[in-house]
């Protein structure tokens, strides 16, 4: 991954914080939950993008070359945006125009665009759909996807918070 211009860390921090809040509003589970404690064997289920140790999202990795980590976050955002665009969220029960889900979708797109280099090729992904005998699963799938997205965004927000605090170029005063 070649080095390229750094993102606007402060803006990414703000957008990712907002996304965390929107994802929570779209699906706030009842009772105890621990977003970041998922079993090891679940990490690769359904090829869900996860931010892992080797992705360079730790403080040293970000300092050395943040592009590795940013690429991983881009992949994750594209993955979830694709799911939010799919039949799982477009079908019944219909989502209201200004619902938290719609706002989440818009903000996800905003952060993706902020991180998307101009020449970055768009990855193609199979659009998931439900057969007629699986229609009852739609609300359950929405719930699982949003829970998974919450976990992803929680880590991404921490990455951007660190970037904003330590990697933002200081303003050079002009004479």
């Amino acid at each position: 991954v070649p080095r390229s211009s750094s993102p606007d860390w402060a803006q990414c921090q703000q957008l990712s914080r907002n996304l965390c809040m929107l994802a929570w509003n779209a699906h706030a589970p009842a009772g105890h939950m621990n977003l970041l404690r998922e079993e090891e064997d679940e990490e690769t289920k359904n090829n869900v993008p996860r931010i892992q140790c080797e992705d360079g999202c730790d403080p040293q990795g970000l300092k050395d070359n943040s592009q590795f980590c940013l690429q991983r976050i881009r992949q994750g955002l594209a993955f979830y945006k694709h799911l939010l665009d799919s039949d799982i969220f477009k079908g019944e029960p219909a989502l209201l125009p200004d619902s938290p889900m719609e706002q989440l979708h818009t903000s996800l797109l905003g952060l993706s665009q902020l991180l998307q280099p101009e020449d970055h090729p768009r990855e193609t992904q199979q659009m998931p759909s439900l057969s007629s005998s699986q229609q009852w699963q739609r609300p359950l799938l929405r719930s699982k996807i949003l829970r998974s997205l919450q976990a992803f965004l929680a880590i991404a927000a921490r990455v951007f918070a660190h970037g904003a605090a330590t990697l933002t170029e200081p303003l050079v005063p002009t004479a």
């Epitope: 699963q137 359950l140 719930s143």
Partner: nanobody, 121 residues
Amino acid sequence: EVQLVESGGGLVQAGGSLRLSCAASGRTFSINALGWFRQAPGKEREFVAAVNWSGGNTYYADSVKGRFTISKDNAKNTVYLQMNSLKPDDTAVYYCAADEYGGISVDFGSWGQGTRVTVSS
């Protein structure tokens, strides 16, 4: 992993009622949904009803809509299946199953041992 224990099955006459219970234990915090499935002799296991554990939304197979009601008691970690207007076709072993968080597919991976329901004509 989630452990599930069903109870409440038995022999009932057509038109009668039964209430099945399913008690969950173990990693109950990881439950996305609990469902009831059934398997009649010589047939494949089929979906009957499910309830979203956190939200409480319910889902039913067309064959039981209006006759069966699924409900839950989070404090007791128990899900119920109230079966009314039973028909001989409802005769089967009824299984409780849990769909847990992790991944993004609906995967009822934890199953109870089943409880037998026999509806006589």
